[in-house]
Amino acid sequence: DHHHHHHEQKLISEEDLRADPCAARPCAHGGRCYAHFSGLVCACAPGYMGARCEFPVHPDGASALPAAPPGLRPGDPQRYL
């Protein structure tokens, strides 16, 4: 009973994921994935936030467009960078 994760026309086995947890590309919106001793870390692209970089940042004034501060920002700036 061999489990596979389908991603971009590629089959990724459970063994592959154990060896490289970032293989499944878990970070959203162009976030960079890093394998950290305590688990995965997503460093978010400008204008995104969240553990998976799943949320667009909304500035005050509630524009529907995400803000774009310079540089990559981790999902958790306090813990990881």
Epitope: A24, P26, A28, S38, G39, L40, V41, C42, M49, G50, A51, R52, E54, F55, P56, V57, H58, A67, R73, G75, D76, P77, Q78, R79
Partner: antibody, heavy 121, light 108 residues
Framework: QVQLVQSGAEVKKPGASVKVSCKAS????????MHWVRQAPGPGLEWMGI????????SYAQKFLGRVTIARDTSTSTVFLDLYSLRSEDTAVYFC??????????????WGQGTLVTVSS | EIVLTQSPGTLSLSPGERATLSCRAS???????LVWYQQKPGQAPRPLIY???TRASGIPDRFSGSGSGADFTLTISRLEPEDFALYYC?????????FGQGTTLEIK
Amino acid sequence: QVQLVQSGAEVKKPGASVKVSCKASGNTFTNYYMHWVRQAPGPGLEWMGIIDPSVGSKSYAQKFLGRVTIARDTSTSTVFLDLYSLRSEDTAVYFCARAGKRFGESYFDYWGQGTLVTVSS
Amino acid sequence: EIVLTQSPGTLSLSPGERATLSCRASQSVSSNFLVWYQQKPGQAPRPLIYGASTRASGIPDRFSGSGSGADFTLTISRLEPEDFALYYCQQYGDSPYTFGQGTTLEIK
């Protein structure tokens, strides 16, 4: 232990605004995300938005854009929800909820007790 | 947005019986980031299972979660009187976070 204590019930008229607060204790405020979720009469939960207290970044559900603001005061470990242009459909219990920042742990592990907001003319 | 559909809407069982609650997503849930909550009247929801199958702190082992992709199940192996409540699933993989409409577990 972790506690999220919310402000008291509010009664508002249509078109008015409401501010709900949520004070966190028993944890490092900036190490967690804070969310707002509402529950209208009867079952049904609706996510409204998130704030990262460490940097103040926030994101809102599309349906609330332009009508909601989430803010935080790190000196008192408090987050705030402001909802504007209230209508009768906004009558609900509003919850704050804490979520982990670690990958895979961003579910709502602690919730406030809820704040009933009633919108009625 | 991801729509979560829970079934059944109401489940009528007796203490000691086994309960099986279903949560189906309109598309695959990223990284199986799905959580089950229990809610009792006048209270906030409390997490039971997160990551589809990991028990939250302090949750008895009669509660278990399974499933992946778009199909998830919460099982209560032997119902206790305090288990009769409202149960919600929620995905926390993609924005906006969304909830199922709930399953009411009532005493038969």
